[in-house]
Structures are given as C-alpha cells and as structure tokens.
C-alpha cells in the first residue's frame, strides 16, 4: 500500500490512569489515540494481551469504540486475581504503534476478620482507658472509627483521641462505660469488630477516715472508716502493719472497728484498708491508751526503832509513766526523785520512787503519802511510820514444845509435854475435851516444866488434851490426842530435841498486801536434822490473844500467808517439821502491818460502807452435825445494812493433828442467806466456827466463835 500524504502514525492523546476499584464493581481504563488511518487498540496486562469481548463474547471485559477498556465487574478472589495488574494500551496503524503510560488497576479489598478485635477494659474513673483495634486487611488500608452503644463517637471531644487504631479516653467517667465497636472502613465498605465492654469502676475513696484517739485504759474506742467505690470495696483493718489479733476486736457492719475495753497493748497505728478491683486506699489513725497510774509495789506501814533507816517502796506503772513524789501528811514539803538532797535532810527519793529516811527520830512518826501523777489520773498511797523504843506489842506466850499424839496401853503411863516461854513467864494449865484437868484425879499431875503425867491409864482417859500457856500478854494452846487401847505402848516415847529439826531463822517480810504477807526464812543451822516441811504461826493483838497456825505443810522457805486483815500488825514464827515432830519456833519476825483497804469502787463511799459493816452484829447459833463430815451453820443478823454482799463462814480444826490450823472460808454470797453447810470435814474432830459479813474487800466484825465436834459415825436417829 502506498503512503498517503495525510496519514500519520498513532499518538496516545488520553493515557489510562491508575485506578482502585472494589471487587465486583465496574470500572474503565481510558485510552484515546489519534492517527491516520485510525489506529486499532489492544490492551496488555503485565505484558500479556488482555482478552476482551472481541475474543470471547462471554468475557467480562469490553473494548469500547473509543479504545477504553471497560470491566463489567472486577473479578478478584482470595487467590485468582485476573483483573489486577499493570495495564498499557497499544495503538497501531500501518505507520507504527504508540504505547500508553502504565496504569495500575488495584482491587480494593476489605476482609471480614479484624486483625485485632478490641477487648474488654476495666478502668478506674479518672484513669485513661485505651481500646485497641487493628482493622481487617484491606486495600486501600482501612481507616477506623469507633461507636459507643451503636452511636459514632465524636473525637472532637477533648478527652477522646483516636490514633492508629487506638481509642484513648484520657479521663474516664462513669458515663463512658458501655459497649464499644471498632469500625474498619475503606471504599469497599465497613466492617464492625466484635464489641468490647468498657467498665468504669471507681477506686475506693474515704467518706470518713479514722481519726487519732487517746483513751483511758478499759474505756471503749471506735475507729470509723466509711468508704465508697465501685465495685463496693472490701474493708479490712490492720494494726501496726499486721493482721488484727483475734478476739479483742469487733468490726461492725459499717466497718467501724470497736474495742470494748482498751488495754495498753492495744496502743498502736490502726489502718483501714479499702480495696476493690481498681484500687486500694489506706487510712490510718493512732490509738494512745492512757493507763491511769497503778501501784506495782505499795508502801506498807512500818514499825521502826529510833536511829534506824527505813525505806518505803513505791513502784508505779501507767501510760505515760507516772511522776512520783512523796509528802509527809501535814507537811507542804514535796519530795521528788533525783532531787538534790537538802542539807540536814534525812529523806531522799530514789529514781524508782522509794522513800528512804535515815536516822529515824520520834518526830518522823506519821503518815507518808506517795503520789503518782499523769495526764490519765493520779493515785496516792499512805504508809504509817511508827517509831518505837522497843516493841510495845508484846506477843502471847510461845509454846516451844507441845504434846504429841500418842497411842498407849491400858495401865501404862502418859507424858504430855508442854514447855513454854514468854515475857512475862507464862503459867501452864491443861484441859481435857475443853474442861479443866486433872481436877482431883490422883493419877494425873502437872510437873515442874509443865508436863502432864497420867499413870495407870484407862480406856476412859482417851481424848483431846490441851496445854494452855497463859500470861498477861495472852495465852497459847497446843492440843494432842491420847488414845488408850489394850495393845498400845506402855509409856510415852520421850523425844529428845536432837531427834527434831533445828529451828528456822527469823522470817523476813518480802511483800505485804492488805490481806497477805510474804515471808522467807532459812532452814535450821547446819548440823541439825533436816526439815520435811514447815508450819507458820501468826499473832496479832487485834485478831486474837493467842498464836494461830496460819500455814501447814509448807514445803518451801518462801511463803505467802493469806487471809489476813487489812491495816493490822502481825508477828510471825516458823517451825520445822520432821517425822519425829516439830522444832522449837524460829525467832519472831519484825512486826508488819498489812496494807489498808483500797478505795472502793466508784460511787461507793467506803467510809459509809465500813461504818455500816461495823454496825452489823452477827449472832452464830450452835452448829448442828448432819453427818460425820458435814455441819450446818446458822446465824441471825441484828440489822441488815445497805452494803452487804454476803457472809464468810470461817472454820478451822482445833483438835487432832492439824489443831489450830489456818482458817478455811466458805462464802455465802447472797445477802439474805442465813445458813451454810460445811462439807468434807474430818470425822471425830473439833472445829471452831465463826461468821463475818463482807462487802467487796470490806469486812465487818466476826461473830463469836462456836465449837463443834464431828461424830465418828453417822448420828443415830
């Protein structure tokens, strides 16, 4: 063919543009060419010719008259992607060809499955909340937005920001709680993530915090702790960073911690811990327990000879530690611990509170008051100093060696020993079953030393024999049982003093309370026989005019004698015991006065109590033997005072091995009670009985004593 002058080769006048299109959607790649003759257009994808409807009428690609490539629908699968690629159109005529610029056809894609679904988030109000989301794979890369409870979130609110798939709420509120959905979107459409729940909890806060408290010991105390939060916080208490000890504390429904009766050990820091899923708060308060001053060692009354030194102990405790000072009653002068001693002053107070007076003068006699003072209260204790030349309180006679229980044969001879001493010298007399003996019986004589001799013994001589040593200072008795049988020994065994243990040392007073005295002593001098036990005897002018056995079978050389009267001077002696009998008595202790009764419970006038109790007159009736081991005691009362709690029935054995043993008590604890039954008594033994009214630690006057002898067998009808 011949070249025409007006012919020219193809030239592309409209190039195809890059396109991104959704799968299944139609699209067109444009291409326009000029040339003469009019060029034919073909399309190539990735270097391969593209089949169109011109090749196969069923093709989804159509070549338009303009030369553009029209796709009825973009075909694009998970694997097969026949339409995606790089396209060029080629225009041809006989003069040549022109190739367009490359145009990429990319298929927009938005998968269903999110690369990262948001997950449930729990935050505390005020904290930031972050919900994370990675949208499904897609092309173009999907953008995201968020919906709360199906409503699109406006990220223009300053608390909310959406950056790179993250929804950030900077300062969460309760109202932010809800269901959040992440929406991934591109030209294909939208995909909703699985919803995620944002729960906004409130960390615990205190509506009421515990406050520091100062209380007195025994007072109740409450620490309040009111909290709020969501979920409702659990509340627990700690003391000094440890769990609360069991039993002492009561935690109420509103989490108030209550201590019913505070003790000094309750002092410390109490922490209320409120905790829930999103937080933990602690609030603490201190408890200071003020313990009012108390005496650890009270000063006791002392009787001291002139020229000697005396020390009154006064040891106290409390919280805070009490300040202690001394004062002599009637004097304005106060004595403090660690005070520089005044010239010519004979008084000083030790750091622990003991008052020492040296070179005692008669003028020092009187009452000394120890006072202990703190913010929690004050206490005082009085102690009397009696100054003597010599002891004016002369004790009753002392029986050095008394009669022993013995079993002798009919027609034998009995020797019942009784050796006594005292100032003035005592006179010795004898009783049989409480009646004067020997009377006119020629078989019985009292020998020079006081020993009772009975010859030609008869069965009828069996009984309890009592030696009584009497002087102007009182009387002392000692009983023994003589049992005359057909088969006994013919004569009394005459114990030699060398068979007996040596007398113990002078007892020392180590402690005194209102009802007790603690004594200590040393065993007999070396070379004497050892003691298996000890007995303690006591004398008080105001209690009786004789020595009383206040303790039997004492196994140690330290013993507390109890059941003594308050504010009463006592003397004590100790005897050693071995199988052969009793030693001579120890030297007498120094006189010791028991403490005065402590002030009564609040609201009771102790002077009134003491006065009323002092006016009570108890009349004891003759005791009745019910069985060989039980006795009924009855009494009447002249007038029933307001202050009476009950009656103390006091009884002791006055015959047998434990003659003049210490008093045993049976309390009738009902004020209206007028009788009591003594049980577990010994058969065939004489008992002395008396009754004393009481109110708390106050005691009234004893009734007159009555004696009763239990039977050997049940009394006959």
């Amino acid at each position: 063919s011949r070249l025409r002058q007006e012919d020219f080769p193809p030239r592309i006048v409209e190039h195809p543009s890059d396109v991104i299109v959704s799968k299944g959607e139609p699209t067109t790649l444009n291409c326009k060419a000029e040339g003469r003759p009019t060029p034919t257009i073909e399309w190539y994808k990735d270097g391969e010719r593209v089949e169109t409807d011109k090749d196969d009428p069923r093709s989804h690609r159509m070549l338009l008259p303009s030369g553009s490539l029209f796709f009825l629908r973009i075909v694009h699968g998970r694997r097969s992607k026949p339409d995606e690629g790089s396209y060029v159109c080629v225009a041809r005529n006989y003069l040549g060809e022109a190739v367009s610029r490359n145009a990429s056809l990319e298929v927009a894609l938005l998968r269903d499955d999110f690369r990262q679904n948001p997950t449930d988030v729990v935050v505390a109000a005020g904290e930031p909340a972050i919900l994370e989301c990675q949208p499904p794979r897609g092309h173009p890369e999907p953008t995201i937005y968020w919906k709360k409870d199906k409503v699109r979130i406006d990220d223009k609110e300053e608390r909310i920001s959406i950056r790179g798939g993250k929804l950030m709420i900077s300062n969460t509120r309760k109202s932010d709680a809800g269901m959040y959905t992440c929406v991934g979107t591109n030209m294909v459409g939208e995909r909703d993530s699985d919803p995620a729940e944002l729960t906004v909890f409130e960390r615990p806060t205190f509506l009421r915090r515990p406050i520091n408290q100062v209380v007195l010991e025994e007072e109740a105390v409450e620490f309040r702790c009111q909290v709020q939060g969501d979920p409702q916080p659990t509340v627990r208490w700690k003391k000094d960073d440890a769990d609360l000890p069991r039993g002492r504390y009561d935690i109420k429904d509103d989490y108030t911690l209550r201590i019913k009766k505070t003790m000094s050990t309750d002092e410390g820091t109490y922490m209320c811990i409120a905790e829930n899923r999103v937080g933990k708060m602690e609030a603490s308060a201190t408890l200071t327990v003020r313990a009012p001053p108390q005496f650890v060692v009270r000063p006791r009354d002392q009787i001291v000879a002139q020229g000697r030194t005396v020390t009154f102990p006064c040891e106290t405790k409390g919280n805070p530690q009490p300040a202690v000072f001394w004062q002599k009653e009637g004097s304005q002068n106060l004595l403090f611990p660690n005070q520089p001693q005044q010239p010519n002053s004979r008084c000083s107070v030790s750091p622990t509170g003991d008052l020492t007076i040296t070179n005692i003068q008669r003028s020092d006699a009187g009452y000394y008051i120890c006072q202990a003072l703190t913010v929690a209260g004050s206490i005082l204790a009085k102690a009397q100093l009696e100054v003597t030349d010599v002891l004016t309180d002369r004790p009753p006679p002392i029986i050095l060696q008394g009669p022993a229980n013995q079993t002798l044969a009919v027609d034998g001879t009995a020797l019942l020993k009784c050796k006594a001493t005292g100032d003035p010298l005592p006179v010795i007399s004898w009783l049989k079953e409480g009646f004067t003996f020997p009377g006119r019986d020629p078989r019985a004589t009292i020998q020079e030393q006081g020993t009772l001799q009975i010859k030609n013994l008869r069965i009828s001589d069996t009984g309890t024999y009592t030696c009584v040593a009497t002087s102007s200072s009182g009387e002392t008795s000692w009983s023994a049982v003589l049992d005359v049988t057909e088969s006994g020994a013919t004569i009394s065994k005459n114990y030699d003093l060398s068979d007996l243990p040596g007398p113990p040392s002078k007892p020392q007073v180590t402690d005194v309370t209102k009802n007790s005295v603690t004594l200590s002593w040393q065993p007999g001098t070396p070379g004497t026989l050892p003691a298996s036990a000890y007995i303690i005897e006591a004398f008080s002018q105001s209690v009786s005019n004789s020595w009383q056995t206040v303790a039997n079978h004492v196994k140690t050389t330290l013993y507390t004698v109890r059941g003594l009267r308050p504010n009463t001077i006592y003397l004590f002696m100790v005897r050693a015991i071995n199988p052969q009998g009793l030693s001579d008595p120890s030297p007498m202790s120094d006189p010791v006065r028991t403490q005065d009764i402590s002030p009564p419970a609040q609201g009771v006038d102790h002077r009134q109590v003491q006065k009323e109790l002092g006016d009570v007159l108890v009349r004891l009736h003759n005791p009745v033997v019910l069985t060989p081991t039980t006795v009924q005691v009855t009494w009447t009362v002249d007038r029933q005072p307001q202050f009476i709690q009950g009656y103390r029935v006091m009884y002791r054995q006055t015959s047998g091995l434990q003659a003049t043993s210490s008093w045993q008590n049976l309390d009738a604890k009902v004020p209206t009670e007028r009788s009591a039954v003594l049980v577990n008594l010994k058969k065939g033994v004489t008992y002395e009985i008396k009754v004393r009214p009481y109110f708390n630690e106050f005691q009234g006057m004893d009734s007159e004593s009555k004696t009763v002898r239990t039977t050997e067998e049940a009394p006959s009808a």
Partner: antibody, heavy 118, light 105 residues
C-alpha cells in the same frame, strides 16, 4: 472459548511416577490459579493442591506433600501435576480446575484416568 | 484443617420434589462455600459460589444459603437431569464434603 484439556489415560506400576498435563485456552493463563483434584472409583472429590501460574508458587495439603509436584509452562499455557511413588490407592481420575475470581472452580478439565497396578 | 460434613450421604426423591442438602464446617468459614454437581463419568460443574451466588448458566431452581458453619443447597423442584452427586467445598482451605447422591425414588 475457555477450556482445559488434559492428557490421556495412564497405567502405571506401583512405585512409578505419573505426569498429567492440562492445557488452558480462551483466557489469560497467568491470571487464574490452577488446582488439581482427584476422584478414586466410587469415591468423593479430593483436593491435591494449587499452582499460581504467574510465579510458580504452589501449595499442597499435608497428605500429598513430598509426593506431588506442580509446574507450569506459561509459553504454552500448560500446567503439570507429577505424582511419584505410586500406590494402588492412587488409582483415580485426576482433574485440573481453574479457580475463578469468585474463589470457586468454574472450569474443569475432562479428567485423566491413572491406573496403578502391578 | 477445616473439615466439611455433608448430609445426607444419599437421598431418594421424585421429580418435582423440593430437595435440601446441608453442609457443616468444623469452624466458621464466613461465606466461603461453593456447591458442585457431578454426573457419572463427567467432571464436576460449579452451581453456587460464595454460599448463595448462582453461577451463570445454572438454572434458578438451585439456591444456596447459610454462613459461618451451616450451609444449605436447595433444589426447589427436582428435574430429571438433576439426579447426580452434589459436593460442597470450602474455599478457604479448598477441601470438599463427602458428597450427597440424589437418586430417583
């Protein structure tokens, strides 16, 4: 017209290998994945794997890994499936199938009967 | 691997009957499910793709439904040419169901 034409029937001894061909026409060969499926006598369809003709990438289920090889020759628009170490239970009709852009096998070959017998 | 379970394995029906075949996936496959028809001695033929889309040239009496794990092929009115074996196939991992043979009653 789009079609897949497979090679003829084969009889093989156990332990031998067989290579079946599948020639595509009427479409752009490199635009669609090619799959192989077999069917033992009286049994169901069993997918054996695919090849991407554009780049030669392949994927097989665990069962056939190590025994099957899939290749292609783009110049003649033909895909091949090679099965080695034949056993009697490999006796089946072997089909090639084109995966459309809708993720389905829209065009199938006529099938090639492979008999493994001693 | 995602397993496909077809039921029933065979059924007898008459021309004009409504026939339903079910296919269950061992885990969710969204809508990636296809249905094929195969007649004896012939290659399988695509009926339904993407669970419910009818392949061009396939009669409208065939329909597909379902998503996730449970899918159904329904033939609204069985025709004589419809007696064949039907297979489901998941297009994520490409495995086939065991097949359902539809026979003349």
């Amino acid at each position: 017209q789009v079609q897949l034409v497979q090679s003829g029937a084969e009889v093989k001894k156990p332990g031998a290998s067989v290579k079946v061909s599948c020639k595509a026409s009427g479409y752009t060969f490199t635009g669609y994945y090619m799959h192989w499926v077999r069917q033992a006598p009286g049994q169901g369809l069993e997918w054996m794997g695919w090849i991407n003709p554009k780049n030669g990438d392949t994927e097989f289920p665990q069962k056939f890994q190590g025994r099957v090889t899939m290749t292609r020759d783009t110049s003649i628009s033909t895909a091949y499936m090679d099965l080695s170490r034949l056993r009697s239970d490999d006796t089946a009709v072997y089909y090639c199938a084109r995966e459309s852009g809708d993720d389905a096998f829209d065009i199938w070959g006529q099938g090639t009967m492979v008999t493994v017998s001693s | 691997d995602i397993q496909m379970t077809q039921s029933p394995s065979s059924l007898s029906a008459s021309v004009g009957d409504r026939v339903t075949i079910t296919c269950r996936a061992s885990q969710s496959i969204s809508s990636y499910l296809n249905w094929y028809q195969q007649k004896p001695g012939k290659a399988p033929k695509l009926l339904i793709y993407a669970a419910s889309s009818l392949q061009s040239g396939v009669p409208s009496r065939f329909s597909g439904s379902g998503s996730g794990t449970d899918f159904t092929l329904t033939i609204s009115s069985l025709q004589p040419e419809d007696f064949a074996t039907y297979y489901c196939q998941q297009s994520v991992g490409l495995f086939f169901g065991g097949g359902t043979k539809v026979e003349i009653k």
